[in-house]
């Protein structure tokens, strides 16, 4: 069933008659050129047809120009993320023009009304860009629109309406309600700029999705599957905020897109990489860690321009805070036999030992089930750079940690009271690093001992052939 927002009103109602009263002089959309990192500094206000502020505030016609576009607001004031983003852009691109599009009067409304205002705000931005294009040396190709939530669709409208094509639009968790399934010209879309990259951090397949679920760019990146963001659980939020509520969880997950983008600006030496995949489940299985044929990319500011014929959905895991980078590994475990498995799936953990560091004990998430006489693929990730892997410890958890598994074990015992020991045979583990694209095979330390059972562990060491490269390109990206 549809989300609980009806139509926005008929086309003929949308003549965009100004709502301002006679006494009101402040325009509904203002363009604030930020001339300092200091949020208290007023900056300069630009307006179409007035060239003096461009000169007074040293607007650099040949440099990159960023337009930051906020979304719907409940407070009617700028939120902290905006100041952080301005500061990060100034730090990274010292000569750039950073313009904050202030449409607070039109955004501080009922959500449905704010949605109805996105078109007129986009049109205002397009008019500003059309005017700037009349100036010598100004190029639309140097324009990068960065829109958060509802602001991402405003950026889409701006790109749609402008005479020509803007260089880039970044959509930071574009709003979902009233845009999910909308016409291509009624939302952010790949047609709106030469390169449209999108970060989705609050999508939900059940209930109301604050962020849009469908891909709307050339590349659409879904960190942590695009839904539950680490560090944003109710417990995390209650721990860090005096009045932690579900609203704070929503804000944390929705706003995470902005912080991932800021991270890509300020921690350019620690870029996060995303990998193309058809869906989140396949990514969780570790199937999608390839960099061939543009299948991986840096996320955020450092993303390489990709204009595929079809949209590219990309996934990655992240840490709970800055720097967000993690190191992804695909683990292929060939199970060549098992005994008396019963109903329950085994719970496996791995510990990776490397030249730089050792990982924590990492769970192997079984997305479907363990197949025998087949290669089972898993995704694991570490927060630290382990360097070259040396050995792996595989542990089969003994006592059940969930009541459900305990109950299944008990039922299993009732039906087969003399159930002999459960056992599984594994000869080798193949590992591929997402970040380096290197592949390595690990063999059991003792070739005679390949069996593992609950409460036991099995050790694997690098097989003789060492690291193998298979014509795979590393995702290492040239920074702009």
């Amino acid at each position: 069933s549809p989300v609980p927002f009806g139509p926005e009103g008929r086309l003929e109602d949308k003549l965009h008659k100004p709502k301002a009263t006679q006494t009101e002089v402040k325009p509904s959309v203002r363009f604030n050129l930020r001339t300092s990192k200091d949020p208290e500094h007023e900056g300069c206000y630009l307006s179409v047809g007035h060239s003096q502020p461009l000169e007074d505030c040293s607007f650099n016609m040949t440099a990159k120009t960023f337009f930051i576009i906020h979304g719907w607001t409940m407070s009617g004031i700028f939120e902290n993320w905006l100041h952080k983003l301005v500061s990060a852009l100034h730090t990274r691109e010292k000569d750039a023009n950073v313009v904050v599009v202030d449409w607070l009067p039109l955004a501080h409304q009922l959500y449905t009304d704010a949605v109805n205002n996105t078109r007129v705000v986009g049109h205002s931005i397009a008019r500003m860009l059309d005017w700037l294009q009349e100036k010598d040396d100004f190029s639309l190709g140097n324009v990068h629109l960065i829109g958060y939530s509802l602001g991402a669709h405003v950026a889409g409208y701006a790109g749609n309406f402008v005479k020509g094509t803007v260089g880039r639009i970044t959509g930071l968790d574009p709003a979902g309600p009233m845009f999910e399934g909308a016409d291509i010209h009624k939302r952010l879309s790949p047609d709106d700029a030469d390169f449209v990259d999108v970060l989705h951090t609050y999508t939900r397949s059940f209930g109301l999705s604050i962020g849009i679920q469908m891909p709307v760019g050339h590349i659409d990146i879904y960190p942590n599957g695009g839904d539950f963001q680490p560090g944003c659980g109710l417990n995390d939020v209650l721990g860090s905020i005096a009045y932690g509520t579900i609203t704070e969880v929503v804000k944390c997950e929705h706003e995470r897109a902005v912080h991932l983008f800021v991270d890509s600006l300020v921690n350019q030496d620690k870029p996060s990489f995303a990998f193309q995949c058809t869906d989140s489940n396949r990514f969780k299985k570790g199937i999608c860690l390839s960099c061939r044929k543009n299948r991986c990319n840096s996320i955020g500011y450092n993303a390489k321009k990709m204009r595929n014929k079809r949209n590219s959905k990309m996934y990655l895991k992240t840490r709970a805070g800055m720097p967000f980078r993690v190191y992804h590994y695909q683990m292929k475990i060939h199970v060549f036999s098992y005994k008396n498995m019963g109903e329950i799936e085994p719970t496996f953990y791995v510990t990776l030992y490397g030249t730089n560091a050792d990982s924590q004990t990492l769970p192997l998430e079984i997305v479907e089930r363990i197949e025998q006489n087949a290669t089972n693929t898993f995704l694991v990730y570490t927060e630290e750079d382990l360097g070259d892997l040396l050995k792996i410890q595989l542990t089969w958890e003994g006592a059940s940690q969930s009541w459900y598994n305990l109950w299944k074990e008990f039922r299993s015992y009732l039906s087969q009271p003399r159930n002999p020991g459960r056992e599984l045979n594994i000869r080798r583990i193949r590992v591929k690093s997402g970040e380096t694209q290197r592949k390595l095979t690990f063999c059991t330390e003792d070739p005679e001992n390949t069996s593992i059972s609950p409460g036991r562990e099995l050790w694997f060491r690098k097989c003789r052939d060492g690291w193998r490269m298979k014509n795979e390109t590393s995702p290492t990206v040239e920074l702009p």
Partner: antibody, heavy 116, light 107 residues
């Protein structure tokens, strides 16, 4: 209310060109895309392309390989669709439609007959 | 280009019947699908947009559902004025593509 009024029926010879007009009223003309859709006798609907009047941006169906050109005149709130190198299979009713949620409102259609 | 395959191409039904028309996209179009009604000699009319939203003035007997590649238009209780041809269209990407149409005739 929103209205799209199209020009009258045309009869053309193969190889000739036809230019159909669509005059819009009742909404902000410059900020909504206007599409052209055709329907051959007894057949389904076929999207030909669309134009955004404000910036004159266009999107065309590759099938028409440079035979179609869409233009606009903002002073009269009119869009035009010109189809060149006409052939008998171009005989159809040509509709303009304004897009918002979908093709929300349609013109009455213009019949173009291509016959030697 | 995304192909939209509609079925059936025609159907016969009586007043009061529940009628279901399906549309299948050749690739994922999420919920970006619209449905139109066209009567002989008339222009098409928008019924449903974004897969499940009724357009202004459309009677509640018309409903749309589906996402991904499979979509359905349902007329819960067919009225005499509903005998027409129905088209689906994806509006996820350019070029926009229509289904072949379903003609609903009187039994």
């Amino acid at each position: 209310q929103v209205q799209l009024v199209q020009s009258g029926a045309e009869v053309k010879k193969p190889g000739a060109s036809v230019k159909v007009s669509c005059k819009a009223s009742g909404y902000t003309f410059t900020t909504y895309w206007i599409a052209w859709v055709r329907q051959a006798p007894g057949q389904g609907l076929e999207w030909m392309g669309e134009i955004l009047p404000g910036s004159a941006k266009t999107k065309y169906n590759k099938k028409f390989k440079g035979r179609v050109t869409m233009t606009r005149d903002t002073s009269t709130s009119t869009v035009y669709m010109e189809l060149s190198s006409l052939r008998s299979e171009d005989t159809a009713v040509y509709y303009c439609a304004v897009y918002d949620y979908g093709a929300d409102y349609w013109g009455q259609g213009t019949t173009v007959t291509v016959s030697s | 280009d995304i192909q939209m395959t509609q079925s059936p191409s025609s159907l016969s039904a009586s007043v009061g019947d529940r009628v279901t028309i399906t549309c299948k996209a050749s690739q994922d179009v999420y919920t970006a699908v619209a449905w139109y009604q066209q009567k002989p000699g008339k222009s098409p009319k928008l019924l449903i947009y974004s897969a499940s939203y009724r357009f202004t003035g459309v009677p509640s007997r018309f409903s749309g559902s589906g996402s991904g590649t499979d979509f359905t238009l349902t007329i819960s209780s067919l009225q005499p004025e509903d005998f027409a041809t129905y088209y689906c269209q994806q509006h996820y990407s350019i070029p926009r593509t229509f289904g072949g149409g379903t003609k609903v005739e009187i039994k």
